[in-house]
């Protein structure tokens, strides 16, 4: 299953990055799982994941750094709290969980660049 | 003539970006001209240029946004005063001006990403 996502995204100076993950659904899935993976330093780690029912809200865990909304076959993902050290390739993984058959799609990744802001001068 | 430069550079939150432009000189040039070009929005513009004698300092015009140093076949370039709107592909062009023969080398470009900082809160 084909998954599309932008090649590059710049995090804002507040450490927030948003991108769209779009999948070409071969069937009429009602339950979809979206996972964001980060690849950096020869390592792949799970950033966040959410399972949602088509037409419903996308819900991540309370302590997740991700938020998102879904619209049809598009998922709008936002990752917050990013620091320069979090720069890396963020890969969108989409699984159509129900009904069968199960489908898996993995995007090419979005390179997210993060620049730490200069600290503001102390107010006297 | 082959010219090497990094693929991507992030400007600091102060709007400063530095990168190395290295050329494989086919001869013993004594006079070298380095030009930084920016390609964005279907347009190529000259950002800055400097001609230097090998072994001497690299001198840009006083009002230039570029500074640089040279060491052998390497030129260390710094561009300052960058804003988000200056994001683009910065291409290093090297010309061996003297003695003949003339040689031209053009790098593949360095994508410089610039993020405008959040303004600091007013101090009361």
């Amino acid at each position: 299953m084909h998954v599309a996502q932008p090649a590059v995204v710049l995090a804002s100076s507040r450490g927030i990055a948003s991108f769209v993950c779009e999948y070409a659904s071969p069937g009429k899935a009602t339950e979809v799982r979206v996972t964001v993976l980060r690849q950096a330093d020869s390592q792949v780690t799970e950033v966040c994941a959410a399972t949602y029912m088509m037409g419903n809200e996308l819900t991540f865990l309370d302590d997740s750094i991700c938020t998102g909304t879904s619209s049809g076959n598009q998922v709008n993902l936002t990752i917050q709290g990013l620091r320069a050290m979090d720069t890396g390739l963020y890969i969108c993984k989409v699984e159509l969980m129900y009904p069968p058959p199960y489908y898996l799609g993995i995007g090419n990744g979005t390179q997210i660049y993060v620049i730490d802001p200069e600290p503001c001068p102390d107010s006297d | 003539m082959h010219v090497a430069q990094p693929a991507v550079v992030l400007a600091s939150s102060r709007g400063i970006a530095s990168f190395v432009c290295e050329y494989a000189s086919p001869g013993k040039a004594t006079e070298v001209r380095v030009t930084v070009l920016r390609q964005a929005d279907s347009q190529v513009t000259e950002v800055c240029a400097a001609t230097y004698m090998m072994g001497n300092e690299l001198t840009f015009l006083d009002d230039s946004i570029c500074t640089g140093t040279s060491s052998g076949n390497q030129v260390n370039l710094t561009i300052q005063g960058l804003r988000a709107m200056d994001t683009g592909l910065y291409i290093c062009k090297v010309e061996l001006m003297y003695p003949p023969p003339y040689y031209l080398g053009i790098g593949n470009g360095t994508q410089i990403y610039v993020i405008d900082p959040e303004p600091c809160p007013d101090s009361d």
């Epitope: - | 003539m1 030009t35 070009l37 390609q39 279907s42 347009q43 190529v44 513009t45 000259e46 291409i91 062009k93 010309e95 023969p101 003339y102 031209l104 053009i106 593949n108 470009g109």
Partner: nanobody, 129 residues
Framework: QVQLQESGGGSVQAGGTLRLSCAVS????????MGWFRQAPGKEREGVAA????????AYADSVKGRFTISQDNAKNTVYLQMNSLKPEDTAMYYC??????????????????????WGQGTQVTVSS
Amino acid sequence: QVQLQESGGGSVQAGGTLRLSCAVSGVTYSPHCMGWFRQAPGKEREGVAAIYNGGGSTAYADSVKGRFTISQDNAKNTVYLQMNSLKPEDTAMYYCGAGSPRFCASATMTGGHHLFGYWGQGTQVTVSS
């Protein structure tokens, strides 16, 4: 040393044709990109057409699409610009330049000439109405 020599310019009436040639010598690097540029008095040099010798892909300025054709003869080390349906606004000095294949498509951008070099002396094209 890379040297480029243009020829084939001249004076023609509007609607006429010309074929410009650029003889290339001393090119030791391959692949490369060859471009045709023009410069009218008091104006910036602008890219007209470019061709990549590694695969024959071409790029044209919007103002000449469908009228001009760039081609090359690798055996003769020559690049041509066939100019048909010439207009008075095509009047300019025409130059060929060599550049990096990565920026072949950039030749026709505003300021694209900055990415080329090894300029020849040029050949004058004058189109009268």
